[in-house]
């Protein structure tokens, strides 16, 4: 039985040109995390494998950085990055857990507290 739950950063509104961190955390289970996939729509952004480490998809190499932890940092945001992002936890013996985060990227004058979305 799958007892775990995924907690996420929550939905985010960010500035065009800025950076944000997407994070998920799996709790309430003793299952072993074997791999975490980060996806947007049907595109694979990155994989963090327990044995092999990180793999960033070639098309996102310039703008996606691994971490912190099992999270993902998106840089140089564009309006086209607006959309839903999925963290997919592959675990043993539970199976797959999925978290969802919606990111809205807005022109600089619109996003709330824009400076807070910059990664130091």
């Amino acid at each position: 039985m799958m007892t775990g739950t995924i907690e996420t950063t929550g939905n985010i509104s960010a500035e065009k040109g800025g950076s944000i961190i997407l994070q998920c955390h799996l709790s309430s289970t003793t299952a072993q995390v074997t791999q975490v996939n980060w996806e947007q729509q049907d595109q694979l952004l990155a994989i963090c494998n327990a044995d092999l480490g990180w793999h960033i998809s070639p098309s996102f190499k310039d703008r996606v950085a691994p971490g912190p932890g099992l999270g993902l940092t998106l840089q140089s945001l564009t309006v086209n990055d607006t959309g839903e992002y999925f963290c997919i936890y592959h675990t043993y013996p539970d199976g797959t857990y999925t978290g969802r985060i919606f990111l809205e990227v807005l022109e600089s004058s619109v996003a709330e507290h824009g400076a807070r979305f910059q990664i130091p």
Epitope: E7, T8, T9, G10, N11, I12, S13, I20, I21, Q23, Q41, V79, N80, T82, G83, E84, R100, I101, F102, E104, L106, V110, A111, E112, H113, R116, F117
Partner: antibody, heavy 119, light 112 residues
């Protein structure tokens, strides 16, 4: 003035599919997310999903995946929701709503489209 | 999904009364950047729902200042300071922090 004009009421047979339209005016259509909301029994509100007119991206409530399909026509500033394989459970009023930028709220609502599924 | 619970279900009032409606969520509505996406709506009979309050406490344009929102974390309140006839209807809160967005069950504001 921001307006969301929805198509008229529908009476459809069980098993059929149908499409509701939502024509936006008074603002830049591609600059705002469009949500769809179901109201059952004149009370409960449920978020069905959203579409990003700018890039066509979608996000669905898992409960409505396979039931609703969201699309847009940028040239006419119109959003569409197709409802598939209708049953009596789908009888409701459906609203399109504009997403309020940066606050994940819904600032403007269409007038609603009443859908009745009956043989 | 985040469960949003509204109380009371029904609120009988007299014109001129001050009332409060509570909205509680099953998990915190503050995202990792400290923003909380909680909004309030009024649905009057025969009309579409209308936005009253967004981001916990911001009044939407044209909304009278007798409406105010407050709260944090999992506990939120809508206050109406002096009830008028046009305030009658169903009130809903909506959390937009977690996917999917979820509405409260509604509070019916009706005359005593």
């Amino acid at each position: 003035e921001v307006q969301l004009q929805q198509s008229g009421p529908e009476l459809v047979k069980p098993g059929a599919s149908m499409k509701i339209s939502c024509k936006a005016s008074g603002y830049s259509f591609t600059g705002y997310i469009m949500n769809w909301v179901k109201q059952s029994h004149g009370k409960n509100l449920e978020w069905i999903g959203l579409i990003i007119p700018y890039n066509g991206g979608t996000s669905y409530n898992q409960k409505f995946k396979g039931k609703a399909t969201l699309t847009v026509d940028k040239s006419s500033s119109t959003a569409y929701m197709e409802l598939l394989s209708l049953t009596s459970e789908d009888s409701a009023v459906y609203y399109c709503t504009r997403g309020l930028q940066r606050f994940y709220a819904m600032d403007y609502w269409g007038q609603g489209t009443s859908v009745t599924v009956s043989s | 999904d985040v469960v949003v619970t509204q109380t009371p279900l029904s609120l009988p009032v007299s014109f001129g009364d001050q009332v409060s409606i509570s909205c509680r969520s099953s998990q915190s509505l503050a995202n990792s950047y400290g923003n909380t996406y909680l909004s309030w709506y009024l649905h009057k009979p025969g009309q579409s729902p209308q936005l009253l309050i967004y981001g916990i406490s911001n009044r939407f344009s044209g909304v009278p200042d007798r409406f105010s929102g407050s709260g944090s974390g999992t506990d939120f309140t809508l206050k109406i300071s002096t009830i008028k006839p046009e305030d009658l209807g169903m009130y809903y809160c909506l959390q937009g922090t977690h996917q999917p967005p979820t509405f409260g069950g509604g509070t019916k504001l009706e005359i005593k």
